[in-house]
């Protein structure tokens, strides 16, 4: 079941949608570019992406600091219950933009800006990323991370935009964790009804990669829920 606004938008955002993504960035001064394409089911909350490092590879840092920018930022693919306005789906065809800061426990910082538009029936994502202050002996530069734990993004309206906050945890090869506080602001390019506060439960997995992580495939499942909802669904 979908809301009235989404019903109108279903002519624009189909049951099955493709996307293209281009990222340019630098981490501790190392510049790179990534191209990718993906597909998914916006009303079911699932998406996959195939990504390729086109410049600056192989990357001298952990892929995991990049992975959320492709999918945690691909917000049109989040499943929403009918009574939560799907702010970002409703932003189309004009689309939306977002900015994010990820503060890691060892002082590393990632800032990201993204533009989401719709062209010829496909989502187009343009991403810029800058990572700074990652210690050379830390888990990111030593590539000791092993993917993100499932997380819950707390969404709430503020100043005419939708804010998201997550405490994210990266798994480490030695069995420990490496934490990041993530804040994102999402803004539609046209006036759109904002939801109240709710959560988006997210599980992001690297499903395949080559040895040097210059070709990577990712899968994400994401679902909006009222603040009481648990995360069990993501593991099914």
């Amino acid at each position: 079941m979908v809301s009235k606004g989404e019903e109108d938008n279903m002519a624009i955002i189909k049951e099955f949608m493709r996307f293209k993504v281009h990222m340019e960035g630098s981490v501790n001064g190392h510049e790179f570019e990534i191209e990718g394409e993906g597909e998914g089911r916006p009303y079911e909350g699932t998406q996959t992406a195939k990504l390729k490092v086109t410049k600056g590879g192989p990357l001298p840092f952990a892929w995991d600091i990049l992975s959320p920018q492709f999918m945690y930022g691909s917000k049109a693919y989040v499943k929403h219950p009918a009574d939560i306005p799907d702010y970002l789906k409703l932003s189309f065809p004009e689309g939306f933009k977002w900015e994010r800061v990820m503060n890691f426990e060892d002082g590393g910082v990632v800032t990201v800006t993204q533009d989401s538009s719709l062209q010829d029936g496909e989502f187009i994502y343009k991403v810029k990323l800058r990572g700074t202050n990652f210690p050379s002996d830390g888990p990111v530069m030593q590539k000791k991370t092993m993917g993100w734990e499932a997380s819950s993004e707390r969404m709430y309206p503020e100043d005419g935009a939708l804010k998201g906050e997550i405490k994210q945890r990266l798994k480490l090869k030695d069995g420990g964790h490496y934490d990041a506080e993530v804040k994102t602001t999402y803004k539609a390019k046209k006036p759109v009804q904002l939801p109240g506060a709710y959560n988006v439960n997210i599980k992001l997995d690297i499903t395949s990669h080559n040895e040097d992580y210059t070709i990577v495939e990712q899968y994400e499942r994401a679902e909006g829920r009222h603040s009481t909802g648990g995360m069990d669904e993501l593991y099914k």
């Epitope: 933009k97 977002w98 900015e99 994010r100 800061v101 800032t111 800006t113 533009d115 810029k128 800058r130 100043d159 005419g160 935009a161 804040k183 994102t184 602001t185 803004k187």
Partner: nanobody, 126 residues
């Protein structure tokens, strides 16, 4: 029309603090990055700090890093520059500017900023 009005400048002793404000009108403030620039007598205008539309992304000139903090209030349509540990070499006219597009990303060039305020004088005495 677009208006940017700076305030908060003045005379302060070295080591002191000032907080500059830039009140804006005539455009959708929350869609645009904002910057602060300064011009000392006989010198070129130089980049001081900038902040993205959301406030998540900030950038500072090396000479002010750790001493100055840029912030914004998207409800009040105002951008601020908190200046601590001021030095005589910070003496200048400080102007705020709005980025030409919403896609600002760490650009420091005057050319990336389109609308400018008249500026406010900051004088730091020894």
């Amino acid at each position: 029309q677009v208006q940017l009005v700076e305030s908060g400048g003045g005379l302060v002793q070295a080591g002191g603090s000032l907080r500059l404000s830039c009140a804006t009108s005539g455009f959708t403030f929350s869609d645009y990055a904002m910057g602060w620039f300064r011009q000392a007598p006989g010198k070129e205008r130089e980049f001081v700090a900038a902040i993205s539309w959301s406030g998540h992304v900030t950038d500072y000139a090396d000479s002010v890093k750790g001493r100055f903090t840029i912030s914004r209030d998207n409800v009040k349509n105002t951008v601020y520059l908190q200046m601590n540990s001021l030095k005589p070499e910070d003496t200048a006219v400080y102007s705020c500017a709005a980025a030409k597009s919403g896609t600002w990303w760490y650009q420091r060039s005057e050319n990336d900023f389109g609308s400018w305020g008249q500026g406010t004088q900051v004088t730091v005495s020894k």
